[in-house]
Interface confidence: low
């Protein structure tokens, strides 16, 4: 229905010019990582450019994690936000770019590119389908931005990365604002229904952000991401947790999740990448 | 109904590698939650040991980290821990279970193994 | 790492009476509302199965004399009244920080 379909709608402000980040891991989305503890942790966002707080899971995740807000932004932010840091190429790219090519364990046997480290170039190579890991481009123009050598050395301008749903590739994702609405939970719960790789029909339950509700979806048994409940209850268990609306100094204050008809999705909480 | 099953030898040696199995059935490995292990040695003391997570993704207890391994056959709805150097300090009952959220829901009925020469 | 005491670390109880066994946490286990504890219940020759989670909340399908509360370091597992198949080794264990711990357990007798 006309309500899925917007479900990937992002309400965002003005745009801003491009970002330069001191540090590459700056601009990887916030990880909570694929474990279930409860832990204040803060990230370099690189849609609101500031540093903010997050839930970590207590394992894995990514290097943009800070104990404490004066850490991140001594990592990831600076006064001067014209001036370009000049260091070399190897601190600067992101470090999936470093990786090996993996195919990944499926056969499906898809085009994609990676950045071979030994050429430095971007190259071509048959992708499986399914796991491998983040040196892994729908296409070469994607590959060459992220990782390729830049005039000025390795520079992040519209960068961020989304995992695609259906076939777990990275998409380039614009540099926006996000609106004033932000989820306060799992960073799983805000993931659209991801059905995997096979070919069951498993009823299962996903929480819908954009409605505030856990609605059912098919299965296909194995793969998908963590958006994924046995049971509605389950569901809403782990992602009850309501919106936390910005107010303009800067305080959060809570707000109802019972808010029909409005959309609201929060970019930097959709780029989910996959863990490497 | 989900249930794990551990199994393996009863005797080891010391300093010889610990391998041991634990077989899911009713619940897919690779559909949710994680997948782990978790010991008792003799007097009651429980360790959490290693998980697998659903995505193939695994964490080790810090203290075990050199020497633990945790892997997965996916076919065979399977999953394993291998623990090498081992010494009568291992000797424990071996548990398998199944992570849901915040708590561990489903257990193995336990295997256990002595360490002795 | 978390570490888990509890206390007693043995105790008898008569039919019918209140066992009371405590669990304290070397740092706190909340976050946001929420606490990480959960208890456990282990017969002789059983796994531990699943009896509170995240303090108080009873898992389905165990009896309403269970009861668990507690928040930030100290927790309570209450059993009232102790029946005989309460005869069990009883252990918390918090899930707020990786590596998730377990306490020394309680042996719970009749007296």
């Known amino acids: 229905d006309s309500e899925e379909d917007e479900e990937h709608t992002i309400i965002t402000d003005t745009e801003l010019p491009p970002l330069k980040l001191m540090h590459s891991f700056c601009a990887f989305k916030a990880d909570d990582g694929p474990c279930k503890a409860i832990m204040k942790r803060f990230f370099f966002n690189i849609f609101t450019r500031q540093c903010e707080e997050f839930i970590y899971g207590g394992c894995e995740g990514n290097q943009n994690r800070f104990e404490s807000l004066e850490e991140c932004k001594k990592m990831c932010t600076r006064d001067n936000a014209n001036r370009i840091i000049k260091t070399t190429l190897q601190q600067e790219k992101p470090d999936f770019c470093f990786l090996e090519e993996d195919p990944g364990i499926c056969r499906g046997y898809i085009t994609r590119y990676f950045y071979n480290n030994q050429t430095k170039q971007c190259e071509r190579f048959k992708y499986g389908g399914c796991l491998g890991n983040m040196n892994n481009f729908e296409t070469l123009e994607e590959c060459k931005n992220i990782c390729e050598d830049g005039p000025n050395g390795f520079q992040v301008d519209n960068y961020g990365t989304q995992l695609n749903a259906v076939n777990n590739s990275l998409t380039p994702q614009s540099t926006k604002v996000p609106s004033l609405f932000e989820f306060h939970g799992p960073s799983w719960c805000l993931t659209p229904a991801d059905r995997g790789l096979c070919r069951a029909n498993e009823n299962r339950f996903y929480y819908n952000s954009v409605i505030g509700k856990c609605r059912p979806f098919k299965y296909s048994g194995c793969g998908g991401n963590e958006n994924n409940f046995t049971s509605k209850q389950e569901c809403l268990r782990a992602c009850k947790k309501g919106f936390i609306q910005r107010i303009s100094k800067g305080g959060l204050i809570k707000t109802k999740r019972k808010r029909k008809k409005q959309r609201v999705k929060i970019a930097y909480e959709e780029i989910f990448v996959k863990n490497m | 109904d989900v249930q794990l099953q551990e199994s393996g030898p009863d005797l080891v040696k010391p300093s010889q590698s610990l391998s041991l199995t634990c077989t899911v059935t009713?619940?897919?490995?690779?559909?949710?939650?994680?997948w782990h292990w978790i010991r008792q040695f003799p007097g009651n003391k429980v360790e959490w040991m290693a998980y697998?997570?659903?995505?193939?993704?695994?964490r080790y207890n810090p203290s075990l980290k050199s020497r633990i391994s945790i892997t997965r056959d996916t076919s065979k709805n399977q999953f394993f821990l291998q623990l090498n150097s081992v010494t009568t300090e291992d000797s424990a009952t071996y548990y398998c279970?199944?992570?849901?959220?915040?708590?561990?829901?489903?257990w193995g009925q336990g295997t256990l193994v002595t360490v002795s020469a | 790492d978390i570490v888990l005491t509890q206390s007693p670390g043995s105790l008898a109880v008569s039919l019918g009476q209140r066992a009371t066994i405590s669990c304290k946490a070397s740092?706190?286990?909340?976050?946001?509302?929420?606490?990480?504890m959960n208890w456990y219940q282990q017969r002789p020759g059983q796994p531990p199965k699943l009896l509170i989670y995240?303090?108080?909340n009873l898992e389905s399908g165990i009896p309403v004399r269970f009861s668990g509360s507690g928040s930030g370091t100290d927790f309570t597992l209450n059993i009232h009244p102790v029946e005989e198949e309460d005869v069990a080794t009883y252990y918390c264990?918090?899930?707020?920080?990786?590596?998730?711990?377990f306490g020394g357990g309680t042996k719970l007798e009749i007296k």
């Open positions: 279970g199944r992570r849901a959220w915040t708590w561990f829901d489903y």
């Open positions: 009713g619940y897919s490995i690779t559909s949710g939650y994680s």
């Open positions: 697998i997570h659903y995505s193939g993704s695994t």
């Open positions: 740092q706190s286990v909340d976050y946001d509302g929420n606490s990480f």
């Open positions: 995240e303090a108080s």
């Open positions: 264990q918090q899930s707020k920080e990786d590596p998730w711990t």
